[in-house]
Interface confidence: medium
């Protein structure tokens, strides 16, 4: 475990106070539990407007997700609620508290509020493998130009320490299966392939197991041949975003092109109530384009600061080269600022977080 990192198993509806800023707290909840995270103001002073973020995306309040300035509640938690949660100051985006939450398949036993007697029941002292950074494993496609080195990583933990093995397209994967071989770095839970070629394309699965269980993760490797083609944009980018009014948003667009690409960010607009012109071409405004002082890497990120309701809408990353154009789009939803968490319970009482 790293310095300043602790792992706690939490019982039903236990409220977890936030760690000191700069620390990351690792928390384990059972399926069906209420995840409650608390982030008191540092030093007990005024907090100011805050926003709760999961895996880099602002959380949308709902009947199940209750968001307040100092507290977050996720009711009836499931595996999908695992991830990295942080409470940030809305204006500065400074992280005040952050938590790594893991929701196990089995519901936690007992009704202990403090969670201190839960470790044996939920099996952390001895237990099945789990991903140590689940929020970092939701990206599945790795697109790489041919001849480069590739590293796949599946960082995991468990007790006893799990073993890791690798499959390619569902079959055991060993060094003799590819020219140039492979490097297995068990200490880093990684697979390394140097100088990849098109025949390396496929699905790579890490299998992490100990006597208590097994987990697996599959990545898809796409090797881009160095032949003339229009730009290739990474699948899933830019991603749809939901943001709270006044927060900052980043859209990312990953461009692969052997010929020098020209990248633009566009926002779709309406003209006289219409989104498209007479010829069917969408009306857009150019938000970001190449200039004398702009690198391709910078153009792959579109930053929106202090978003307003007018910023909501469709955004497009457009990449062109001498062969042709490619584009991917994403939507931004802007929600009103939620200053307080207010929930009426069954008795009709109201509390403010």
């Amino acid at each position: 475990e790293s310095l300043g990192t602790e792992q706690r198993v939490v019982g039903r509806a236990a409220e977890v106070p936030g760690p000191e800023p700069g620390q990351q707290e690792q928390l384990v909840f059972g399926s069906g539990d209420a995840v409650e995270l608390s982030c008191p103001p540092p030093g007990g002073g005024p907090m100011g407007p805050t926003v709760w973020v999961k895996d880099g995306t602002g959380l949308v309040p709902s009947e199940r997700v209750l968001v307040g300035p100092q507290r977050l509640q996720v009711l009836n938690a499931s595996h999908e609620d695992s991830g990295a949660y942080s409470c940030r100051q809305r204006l500065t985006q400074r992280v005040l508290c952050h938590f790594s939450v893991r929701v196990t398949d089995a519901p936690s036993s007992g009704d202990d509020e403090d969670g201190e007697d839960e470790a044996e029941d939920t099996g952390v002292d001895t237990g099945a493998p789990y991903w140590t950074r689940p929020e970092r494993m939701d990206k599945k496609l790795l697109a790489v130009p041919a001849a480069n080195t590739v590293r796949f990583r599946c960082p995991a933990a468990g007790n006893p320490t799990p073993s890791i093995s690798w499959l390619k397209n569902g079959r055991e994967f060993r060094g003799e299966h590819r020219i140039g071989g492979i490097k297995l770095r068990h200490q880093q839970w990684s697979l390394v392939m140097e100088s990849v070629v098109p025949s390396d394309r496929g699905n790579y699965t890490c299998v992490v197991e100990n006597k208590f269980g097994s987990i697996r993760q599959t990545y898809t490797l796409d090797v881009l041949e160095r032949s003339p083609h229009r730009p290739i944009l990474q699948a899933g980018l830019p991603a749809n975003q939901t943001a709270v009014l006044g927060s900052d948003v980043e859209f990312h667009c990953k461009v692969y092109s052997d010929a020098q690409p020209h990248i633009q960010w566009l926002k779709h607009v309406e003209v006289n109530g219409s989104k498209v012109g007479p010829d069917g071409t969408p009306y857009v405004t150019v938000l970001k384009t190449a200039g004398a002082n702009t690198t391709d890497k910078e153009l792959e990120v579109l930053s929106l600061h202090n978003v307003t309701f007018e910023d909501a809408g469709e955004y497009t990353c457009l990449a062109g080269n001498s062969i042709g154009f490619s584009h991917h789009s994403a939507w931004l939803v802007v929600l009103p600022a939620e200053e307080e968490l207010v929930e009426a319970d069954e008795a009709g009482s109201v509390y403010a977080g």
């Epitope: 790293s2 880099g56 140590t132 950074r133 970092r136 494993m137 990206k139 496609l141 790795l142 697109a143 790489v144 130009p145 001849a147 480069n148 080195t149 590739v150 590293r151 796949f152 990583r153 960082p155 770095r185 200490q187 880093q188 390394v192 140097e194 100088s195 990545y219 990474q234 899933g236 980018l237 990312h252 990953k254 890497k297 990120v301």
Partner: antibody, heavy 130, light 106 residues
Framework: QVQLKESGPALVKPTQTLTLTCTFS??????????VGWIRQPPGKALEWLAL???????YYSTSLKTRLTISKDTSKNQVVLTMTNMDPVDTATYYC??????????????????????WGQGTLVTVSS | DIELTQPPSVSVAPGQTARISCSGD??????ASWYQQKPGQAPVLVIY???DRPSGIPERFSGSNSGNTATLTISGTQAEDEADYYC?????????FGGGTKLTVL
């Protein structure tokens, strides 16, 4: 064995352009996953990464200095050249070139590139003064 | 970009274990390298890929990396280990160095 050596003027005047050359041996800049980078170190201060050039001619620049930097390579001569415009006394530093290895991995927003610098030149001190 | 934070200085008695930390957001998701720099000399790679040693680097140098912190450990520190140490990683296709730590062997 791998060797790198930086060359260029020891003294430049403010507003002038600095041109540094890194001449290397023991490896080829046409080998996949290999590149050459420039790092500088003002007297008594920390290392600061400036620019990288990959075996396949991809170029990366420090965000804070990108408007002033240009990196290029001559694979046949085993040389990498860095130019830095509009020099200022705060640019006084020892400038190092270094070989690096790069790889692709899964990052938070999809594939990202990682680096590790395994061989360094001896460095050349550049003073900016009128 | 990620920022890597190191303590400015660490002191250790000869023969004791020195630990130098390097912290950055989700640093454990990336690979960290460590460089040793003695006065008037160029940096030398002492640890790469979190915990691997290049040939010629003594076994007393080791490394780890998890969570938000990478750590360089020097077991049985010797007088010749007195130097500046820099951690290095990467983010969004950029290389990043820490601010450096001066290791003093008392």
């Amino acid at each position: 064995q791998v060797q790198l050596k930086e060359s260029g003027p020891a003294l430049v005047k403010p507003t002038q352009t600095l041109t540094l050359t890194c001449t290397f041996s023991g490896f080829s800049l046409s080998t996949s996953g290999v590149g050459v980078g420039w790092i500088r170190q003002p007297p008594g201060k920390a290392l600061e990464w400036l620019a990288l050039i990959d075996w396949d001619d991809d170029k990366y620049y420090s965000t804070s200095l990108k408007t002033r930097l240009t990196i290029s390579k001559d694979t046949s001569k085993n040389q990498v050249v860095l130019t830095m415009t509009n020099m200022d006394p705060v640019d006084t530093a020892t400038y190092y070139c270094a070989r690096y290895h790069s790889w692709y991995e899964m990052g938070y927003y999809g594939s990202t590139v990682g680096y590790m610098f395994d061989y360094w030149g001896q460095g050349t001190l550049v003073t900016v003064s009128s | 970009d990620i920022e890597l934070t190191q303590p400015p200085s660490v002191s250790v008695a000869p023969g004791q274990t020195a630990r130098i930390s390097c912290s950055g957001d989700a640093l454990g998701d990336k690979y960290a390298s460590w460089y040793q720099q003695k006065p008037g000399q160029a940096p030398v790679l002492v640890i790469y890929d979190d915990s691997d040693r290049p040939s010629g680097i003594p076994e007393r140098f080791s490394g780890s990396n998890s969570g938000n912190t990478a750590t360089l450990t020097i077991s049985g520190t010797q007088a010749e280990d007195e130097a500046d140490y820099y951690c290095q990683s990467y983010d969004f296709d950029f290389a990043v160095f820490g601010g450096g730590t001066k290791l003093t062997v008392l």
